[in-house]
Interface confidence: low
């Protein structure tokens, strides 16, 4: 998977008046990394792992960047003409990625009241607008404003892309990101499904990085895809991930089944509890 940095900024307007604050979150490699504390006017790391990324470095550059971006987005919202009464939001999502082959990607997306209306591929300088007439109107509005602003030139977008990649590389210099390995906690549970059948669920939690193989095996062989149900690999809010796989098997055959897990070059096999034992939990090293 590529390394990525994702900025998510939102500004609000009430009855046509743009509100002073803004909301901002930054995700690093898909994990919540920073957020802007509106009360303190500071960028704050999201959890211990995020603090560890910069070690003893200060968060001033992040604070300045987010503040500047929030200010820009507020000005953009002020130029959207169709602001009716009530609460409205303008959201900007910027993503930059560094792939394994060292190639880079960068994109920018604008949402109004949660609806995508404008996207840009920064490398190709290509803007995309959805078909709806509302999106077309909003996009024209914003594009015109961005064109009027002398700062929003091609150079600006390339600089923005370069800044994003520079920050991403700066974070990746941290051994916390590059060499971070958190082994999964593996739980195997069983529950009654129907007469004569049980559902075996294998859960892996609190692991990093995101890539993991989790499957149910019968007599040491992985079951076919269609006999297993997989959950998404999702952030658990602590800078780590969680996922699960579930399979229906015949009661009494539990000893033939195992949960197989592979992560960061390590692998382990976990038995299915039989009889009254409902949970087997292990944290492998």
């Amino acid at each position: 998977e590529p390394h990525s940095l994702r900025y998510n900024l939102t500004v609000l307007s009430w009855d046509g008046s743009v509100q002073s604050g803004f909301l901002a979150e930054v995700h690093l490699d898909g994990q919540p990394f920073l957020r802007y504390d509106r009360q303190k006017c500071r960028a704050k790391p999201q959890g211990q792992w995020a603090e560890d990324v910069l070690g003893n470095k200060t968060w001033d550059r992040e604070t300045r960047d987010l503040t500047g971006n929030g200010k820009d987005l507020r000005m953009t919202l002020a130029h959207i003409k169709d602001q009716k009464e009530g609460l409205h939001s303008l959201q900007e999502i910027r993503v930059c990625e560094i792939h394994e082959d060292n190639s880079t990607r960068s994109s920018q997306h604008f949402y109004y009241d949660g609806e995508l209306f404008l996207s840009q591929n920064v490398e190709t300088e290509e803007w995309t607008v959805p078909q709806s007439s509302r999106a077309q109107t909003l996009a024209m509005n914003v594009r015109n404003f961005l064109k009027e602003d002398a700062m929003k030139t091609k150079t600006h977008y390339h600089a923005m892309h370069a800044d994003c990649l520079q920050e991403l590389r700066r974070y990746l210099e941290s051994s916390v990101v590059l060499r971070r390995r958190v082994p999964p906690m593996v739980n195997v549970t069983r529950s009654e499904a129907s007469e004569g059948n049980i559902t075996v669920t294998c859960r892996a939690s609190s692991f990093y990085p995101r890539n993991i193989t989790l499957s149910t095996r019968q007599d040491g062989v992985s079951l076919s895809h269609d006999t297993q149900q997989w959950g998404d690999v999702l952030p658990d809010g602590n800078g780590t991930y969680q996922t699960w796989v579930a399979t229906r098997i015949c009661q009494g055959e539990e000893q033939r089944f195992t949960c197989y897990m592979e992560h960061s070059g390590n692998h382990s096999t976990h038995p299915v509890p039989s009889g009254k034992v409902l949970v087997l939990q292990s944290h492998w090293q």
Partner: antibody, heavy 117, light 107 residues
Framework: QVQLVESGGDVVQPGRSLRLSCAAS????????IHWVRQAPGKGLEWVAV????????YYADSVKGRFIISRDNSKNTLYLQMNSLRAEDTAVYYC??????????WGQGTMVTVSS | AIQLTQSPSSLSASVGDRVTITCRAS??????LAWYQQKPGKVPKSLIY???SLESGVPSRFSGSGSGTDFTLTISSLQPEDFATYYC?????????FGQGTRLEIK
């Protein structure tokens, strides 16, 4: 008017303690990291310590680590520097400084600390 | 700790001259560098932050550039009030460090 005013400087003997204060006004004190910076007579600027806006994190220069303690009281808009086991080389003008947030565009007028027997 | 080395340590120049002071960091600090001016018996004054951003109220004859490890402060046309000591400071990581200073004197 944005202002930082230091106080508490004095002449003390080596090994003794001293507490400096820095009173802030004209800005939202609780939003800013505040630092102590010192300057020995005829010498350059030396950073001493910083305390985060919420008082949680504190960092010190190696030369004062274990001897000096930085603290703040946001309800009083005041920063403190407790200096213990003072040495002759701690003799300096002590400034409190702040800014957006760790490049200092707000400086106090300084308070002189002399460590001498 | 990151070390900052300023050069020259002192220099003599005349009113109207263009002056450049350099600051080299012992490791990369991106653009987390500030420049200060200090006159004898006075408090340091912020000139530049983020390597190249001019502090409000500072004359435009002052400019900063650089990123990574090499930075410069330039005074395009020296004025009588510019004779002072100049310090660079990194705020990329703690401990924050200052350069040893550059004393600018009248020739």
């Amino acid at each position: 008017q944005v202002q930082l005013v230091e106080s508490g400087g004095d002449v003390v003997q080596p090994g003794r303690s001293l507490r400096l204060s820095c009173a802030a006004s004209g800005f939202t004190f609780s939003n800013y990291n505040i630092h102590w910076v010192r300057q020995a007579p005829g010498k350059g600027l030396e950073w001493v310590a910083v305390i985060r806006y919420d008082g949680i994190n504190k960092y010190y220069a190696d030369s004062v680590k274990g001897r000096f303690i930085i603290s703040r009281d946001n309800s009083k808009n005041t920063l403190y520097l407790q200096m213990n086991s003072l040495r002759a080389e701690d003799t300096a003008v002590y400034y409190c400084a702040s800014g957006p947030p760790d490049a200092f565009n707000i400086w106090g007028q300084g308070t002189m600390v002399t460590v001498s027997s | 700790a990151i070390q900052l080395t300023q050069s020259p340590s002192s220099l003599s120049a005349s009113v109207g001259d263009r002056v450049t002071i350099t600051c080299r960091a012992s490791q990369g600090i991106s653009s987390a560098l500030a420049w200060y001016q200090q006159k004898p018996g006075k408090v340091p004054k912020s000139l530049i932050y983020d390597a190249s951003s001019l502090e409000s109220g500072v004359p435009s004859r002052f400019s900063g550039s650089g990123s990574g490890t090499d930075f410069t402060l330039t005074i395009s046309s020296l004025q009588p009030e510019d004779f002072a000591t100049y310090y660079c400071q990194q705020f990329n990581s703690y401990p924050i460090t200052f350069g040893q200073g550059t004393r600018l004197e009248i020739k």
